[in-house]
Amino acid sequence: MAVTACQGLGFVVSLIGIAGIIAATCMDQWSTQDLYNNPVTAVFNYQGLWRSCVRESSGFTECRGYFTLLGLPAMLQAVRALMIVGIVLGAIGLLVSIFALKCIRIGSMEDSAKANMTLTSGIMFIVSGLCAIAGVSVFANMLVTNFWMSTANMYTGMGGMVQTVQTRYTFGAALFVGWVAGGLTLIGGVMMCIACRGLAPEETNYKAVSYHASGHSVAYKPGGFKASTGFGSNTKNKKIYDGGARTEDEVQSYPSKHDYV
């Protein structure tokens, strides 16, 4: 039961995390105009990974996409790549983890297969979360560097008379969404890996015979063979690493002696 709960919770947490990574990637507020210690303007600037926007006090908002690839800073391209890799890995991980869920039965999938799929999805979630955290952190570092550079020469005077106020940018909402989402995906991945250890059955060194109870088409497996239902042509006994007598419907699981993490 604990394994199913851990796996289910890991899936839900990862799902929320990946949704957050997608949201952060699409958001326009990666960097927002710094309002502190600046003259109050009627225009507010903010930028995302894909476009920059200007919101006027009148309520009018205008956004312009970055219609160039070569002209963009390498760091921005790297952040885009990290976020997209994170989303792709996360999406594949979600797909794999759906089939790996203990509460979902697909044909006669063995526990070992589910364990492997759970581990795979867990690793994918961890890498996905790390990609998102790395992407957001790289962007944040870029902002901090630019912020202090623009602060150093915030007012570039022309003959001491005319001043040009340089727009400084600070952390936008998307950064915080990205950090939280990446963290959640990472946590979800770890939970999936923990659940995998519980799903992976113990290897036994003895053979067992499959007994068919009369009147029932459910095979009883006291040892290392998988119970097979009478549906379809799945009547062959299949060897799995299982340490105890269990039917397919039971949720009790045993820790594996193999370290999958």
């Epitope: 003259p39 930028q47 920059s52 006027e56 006090s57 009148s58 309520g59 001043q163 040009t164």
Partner: antibody
């Protein structure tokens, strides 16, 4: 057709209060910002205050703390509550609508004269 | 506050001739986010409220004759009347629409020579 009509001007003693109104028609106050701009006799234009479509307000330093801009969206009316009036507040007060994009005043009222004198 | 300085204070031009009014702001009115200049030009005739001519430093308001044009960026702006007409006699104001409080220039009076 967009129209702005100011009212409430008159002669008032220094230190007293006065409330100006601006009736707007042809547009809604929930969609556009509206300004108060004044012009002292024989002088140039001076921006006074603005209330934006969302209700946010901004003021000129010379009137901050004394004047309050507000609006009644249901009545489509803009107000300027002027307290602690001074002789230098004597001017023709215009209300003007913000055009929306790139922030400029595209429609103006005819103005109402406020005279602060003892 | 942002100081808007217009030059000259008054200008006498012959009918059909070009009139040029300059406006200088104490800080740049160019927004880096959209590369737009937040500056407007107004015309005020005696006994009338001001009328918007140009916004965004160079965009002509609808209904404004094309002899009026605006140019400039950052801190230096120009209003040009390519061929002065009798009805163009008025006071012209530039206005900062970027920094609060929005400030006007002192005005330039255009007369016929």
């Amino acid at each position: 057709q967009v129209q702005l009509v100011e009212s409430g001007g008159g002669v008032v003693q220094p230190g007293r209060s006065l409330r100006l109104s601006c009736a707007a028609s042809g547009f809604t106050l929930t969609s556009y910002g509206v300004y108060w701009v004044r012009q002292a006799p024989g002088k140039g234009l001076e921006w006074v205050a603005v209330v934006w479509a969302g209700g946010n307000t901004n003021y000129a330093d010379s009137v901050k703390g004394r004047f309050t801009i507000s609006k009644d969206n249901s009545k489509s009316t803009l107000y300027l509550q002027m307290n602690s009036l001074r002789a230098e507040d004597t001017a023709v007060y215009y209300c003007a609508r913000d055009r929306g994009r790139l922030l400029a005043m595209d429609y103006w009222g005819q103005g109402t004269l406020v005279t602060v004198s003892s | 506050d942002i100081v808007m300085t217009q030059s000259p204070d008054s200008l006498a031009v012959s009918l059909g001739e070009r009139a040029t009014i300059n406006c200088k702001s104490s800080q740049s009115l160019l927004n880096s986010g959209n590369q737009k200049n937040y500056l407007a030009w107004y015309q005020q005739k005696p006994g009338q409220p001001p009328k918007l001519l140009i916004y965004g430093a160079s965009t002509r308001e609808s209904g404004v004759p094309d002899r009026f044009s605006g140019s400039g960026s950052g801190t230096d702006f120009t209003l040009t009347i390519s061929s002065l007409q009798a009805e163009d006699v008025a006071v012209y104001y530039c206005q900062n629409d970027y920094f609060f409080p929005f400030t006007f220039g002192q005005g330039t009076k255009v007369e016929i020579k």
